[in-house]
């Protein structure tokens, strides 16, 4: 006899990285017929929603109109059908960005390198932080974490054309409070003609704002949140 229902999916729209004072919606997707959804923040009950009619709704949304450092942290959700509760969802790390300062990102030896070259990114921020994060724009939200007093090094190793793309870095004041993003660095890796033509590449984005990137990770996968790559989320833990 089943004692619990399957865990729901949890995600943030437009993204789990939210600029301060901007809005974000936490989504929780359970099953049709769920009469109650609970959102927990840092282990305590944060909000409740009772969908109507429950048999036609399998997803609820919890809206945060004004992101700040107090709202940043770990969220999870559960739902119930009748008296039976679900397993808790995976943890969603909601991060507030655009805090305090802007780091500078540089790449060694440079932004246009030959295939096989060893490439290292350097993220520098002179204010009080010791953790840095390097993100490659794209659907899978590649994230690396680095440490240092004023800078961190992110060695990519010998690069291939698959490393092409746009990178940014953040200083992290704690796991859930990040700096403004650095200016982007676009890495171009040139190889043999055959290699280049076959190279996998993350989707490219309009060069307007960082917000464009913030919209990509989950919205590209909204039809099936089971596919959502938790690389960045897991890294925070």
């Amino acid at each position: 006899q089943q004692q619990t229902l399957p865990k729901p999916f949890i995600w943030a729209e437009p993204h789990f990285m939210v600029p301060k004072e901007k809005q974000v919606t936490i989504c929780c997707q359970g099953n049709y017929g769920a009469v109650e959804y609970q959102l927990h923040f840092e282990g305590s009950l944060f909000a409740v929603d009772r969908p109507k009619p429950p048999e036609r709704i399998n997803k609820v949304q919890f809206y945060i109109p004004d992101m700040n450092s107090r709202m940043a942290g770990q969220y999870s959700c559960i739902y119930r059908v009748g008296e039976l509760w679900s397993e808790p969802s995976n943890l969603l790390d909601l991060v507030v960005t655009e805090m305090y300062d802007t780091p500078t990102l540089s790449v060694h030896p440079g932004p246009e390198v030959i295939s096989g070259e060893k490439v290292t990114f350097y993220c520098r921020l002179d204010t009080a932080t010791s953790m840095f994060l390097l993100l490659k724009e794209g659907r899978s939200s590649h994230v690396q974490r680095g440490y240092g007093k004023v800078q961190a090094e992110f060695p990519l190793g010998p690069v291939t054309t698959a490393h092409r793309g746009t990178y940014r870095c953040f200083g992290s004041y704690n796991n859930h409070a990040w700096s403004f993003p650095s200016e982007p660095v676009k890495l171009l890796v040139t190889g043999d003609i055959e290699n280049t033509s076959l190279a996998p590449e993350d989707p490219t984005f309009p060069a307007d704002t960082w917000g464009t990137y913030l919209l990509t990770t989950e919205t590209g996968l909204q039809k099936d949140h089971a596919l959502w790559d938790h690389t960045a989320q897991n890294l925070l833990r």
């Epitope: 540089s106 060694h108 030896p109 096989g116 520098r124």
Partner: antibody, heavy 120, light 107 residues
Framework: QVQLQQPGAELVKPGASVKLSCKAS????????MHWVKQRPGQGLEWIGM????????NYNEKFKSKATLTVDKSSSTAYMQLSSLTSEDSAVYYC?????????????WGQGTTLTVSS | DIKMTQSPSSMYASLGERVTITCKAS??????LSWFQQKPGKSPKTLIY???RLVDGVPSRFSGSGSGQDYSLTISSLEYEDVGMYYC?????????FGGGTKLEIK
């Protein structure tokens, strides 16, 4: 054309500090890593470290971490290396070199070197 | 740190002779190796990078080869202007490290 200009010589006393300069011209200073290399009289070359002029990011040879401090002044396109607590072991020729920004280990341009003499 | 052992430390060769200088790394450096030439009183000049790639403007008599820990610089036919010091540099790992140098003179 690309030039890295360094003063020909510096004479300093033991225990003092010195700030060696490398003025770049003929290219976008902030786009290339600048390296510093030491050569003692009649001896080989030693890599001290490198700095990115745009970000100020650095990478030092551990051996020189407490000896050398690399900085830049973007407004004058000048890279600096400060050497502290000087001893006779620091007497050497110091070169700045611009690395190609598409391949490591390819030092495209070198300064003519500054001969540092530490003597009382 | 990776140690680069260069040999010979000095050598004499005749004009037109084929000259080979070797560099051995204390570990595999994955062909991340450059060769430099330095003439007396002058700054070094890069000849080869990535073990075998010739820098633009460097005469084709210079060539580089090797992999793993063992690398060599060859001058196919020695010319008078080739006299000077030659250094290898590994840049597989920080800190970059140079070989001890080879002094090449005309016999």
């Amino acid at each position: 054309q690309v030039q890295l200009q360094q003063p020909g010589a510096e004479l300093v006393k033991p225990g003092a500090s010195v700030k060696l300069s490398c003025k770049a011209s003929g290219y976008i200073f902030t786009s290339y890593w600048m390296h510093w290399v030491k050569q003692r009289p009649g001896q080989g070359l030693e890599w001290i470290g490198m700095i990115h002029p745009n970000s100020g990011s650095t990478n030092y040879n551990e051996k020189f971490k407490s000896k050398a401090t690399l900085t830049v002044d973007k407004s004058s396109s000048t890279a600096y290396m400060q050497l502290s607590s000087l001893t006779s072991e620091d007497s050497a020729v110091y070169y700045c070199a611009r690395e190609g920004n598409w391949a490591r280990g390819y030092f495209e341009y070198w300064g003519q070197g500054t001969t540092l003499t530490v003597s009382s | 740190d990776i140690k680069m052992t260069q040999s010979p430390s000095s050598m004499y060769a005749s004009l037109g002779e084929r000259v080979t200088i070797t560099c051995k790394a204390s570990q595999d450096i994955n062909s991340y190796l450059s060769w430099f030439q330095q003439k007396p009183g002058k700054s070094p000049k890069t000849l080869i990078y990535r073990a075998n790639r010739l820098v633009d403007g460097v005469p084709s008599r210079f060539s580089g080869s090797g992999s793993g820990q063992d690398y060599s610089l060859t001058i196919s036919s020695l010319e008078y202007e080739d006299v000077g010091m030659y250094y290898c540099l590994q840049y597989d790992e920080f800190p970059y490290t140079f070989g001890g140098g080879t002094k090449l003179e005309i016999k």
